[in-house]
């Protein structure tokens, strides 16, 4: 990995959990300042493999909301509109980063955690031909 | 939004910075145990608007390596394999938090913060009609 | 932030051509497409080709299919623009872009231009 030149001016890191825990300031930065994340809302609709998001809430992550992709066919939308099930409607997925309250319902303590979330759909051609 | 009972035994939230800095436990919980995340890693190719996927490495970013997908066609690709330019290929966007070290080049100091991936591309019906 | 910097304009004759050029820096992991555009006096940017940088593939508005041709240098961060069989009507300030959503990208999103380079075509 790359060594990074460690800063002077560090917080103590005496702790006996260290490097385990470490202090996180919640303040968010909000790095999309030359983009609109709002700009693939209508994509969900316009897509040859349309999809709807369902809203995950759980008051012990953050963010506590999540919002996922389901997509809506089998198939995929083609030009007249109809579902064409020669190709495949499938789900792309990331590994995200949340945090956890852990012990549970502390409001300044937190674990790492990794999920798996569906950002949208795509059309695929299929690999699997077992259906008539 | 949601009130939390407290946990009698979280730590203590004296701090003056308290609650804009929290204590995180970088020991990674999975929660993908019924899941493949490698499963989607072909869509890329087989979808009718495939991408590539690029390294973006920043070792002040934990994660350090985030992948960013770049759709490889301003049009998707038709039955016969070629670019159909009466659709667009487009990048599904998601908003990720990451940590960033603050002050910088700090082991265990960090700060949130909200990037924009590009996860994958779809195919979706033009708005915008400039082309010929 | 992404630094564009345009050049090759200049002051050509009906039926001439001219090459243009467009030096990107600091462009985002996830950039697919790149485009240029013109704004002739009074009237509104508009859209004149694009070209995605993995696939190589172009799309041109209408008023410059057959006289124009876009290309990119993937490895100079560089998209040209060549302009053959010139027309009074292409005079014009000429500007490059990243396209964020390729041909989806509307003229309104685009927060950052270059300078440009003004295209003269004479009768």
């Known amino acids: 990995g790359i060594t990074i030149p460690r800063n002077p001016g560090c917080p103590n890191s005496e702790d006996k959990n260290f490097p385990r825990t470490v202090m996180v300031n919640l303040n968010i930065h909000n790095r999309n300042t030359n983009t609109n994340p709002k700009r693939s809302s209508d994509y969900y609709n316009r897509s040859t493999s349309p999809w709807n998001l369902h809203r995950n809430e759980d008051p012990e992550r953050y963010p506590s909301v999540i919002w996922e992709a389901k997509c809506r066919h089998l198939g995929c939308i083609n030009a007249d509109g109809n579902v064409d099930y020669h190709m495949n409607s499938v789900p792309i997925q990331q590994e995200i980063l949340v945090l956890r309250r852990e012990p549970p319902h502390c409001p300044n303590s937190f674990r790492l955690e990794k999920i798996l979330v569906s950002v949208g759909c795509t059309c695929v051609t299929p690999i699997v031909h077992h259906v008539a | 939004g949601i009130t939390i009972p407290r946990n009698p035994g979280c730590p203590n939230s004296e701090d003056k910075n308290f609650p804009r800095t929290v204590m995180v436990n970088l020991n990674i919980h999975n929660r993908n145990t019924n899941t493949n995340p490698k499963r989607s890693s072909d869509y890329y190719n087989r979808s009718t608007s495939p991408w590539n996927l690029h390294r973006n490495e920043d070792p002040e970013r934990y994660p350090s390596v985030i992948w960013e997908a770049k759709c490889r066609h301003l049009g998707c690709i038709n039955a016969d394999g070629n670019v159909d330019y009466h659709m667009n290929s487009v990048p599904i966007q998601q908003e990720i938090l990451v940590l960033r070290r603050e002050p910088p080049h700090c082991p265990n100091s960090f700060r949130l913060e909200k990037i924009l991936v590009s996860v994958g591309c779809t195919c979706v019906t033009p708005i915008v009609h400039h082309v010929a | 932030q992404v630094q564009l910097v345009e050049s090759g304009g200049g002051l050509v004759q009906v039926g001439g051509s001219l090459r243009l050029s467009c030096e990107v820096s600091?462009?985002?992991?996830?950039?697919?497409?790149m485009g240029w555009f013109r704004q002739a006096p009074e009237k509104e940017r508009e859209f004149v080709a694009a070209i995605s940088w993995i696939g190589g593939d172009s799309r041109y508005a209408h008023f410059v299919k057959g006289r124009f041709t876009i290309s990119r240098d993937n490895a100079k961060n560089t998209v040209h623009l060549q302009m053959d069989s010139l027309k009074p009507e292409d005079t014009a300030v000429y500007y490059c872009?990243?396209?964020?959503?390729?041909?989806?990208?509307?003229?309104?999103?685009?927060?950052?231009w270059g300078q440009g380079t003004q295209v003269t075509v004479s009768s």
């Open positions: 600091g462009l985002p992991v996830s950039s697919y497409a």
């Open positions: 872009n990243d396209m964020p959503y390729g041909l989806d990208t509307r003229m309104d999103e685009y927060e950052y």
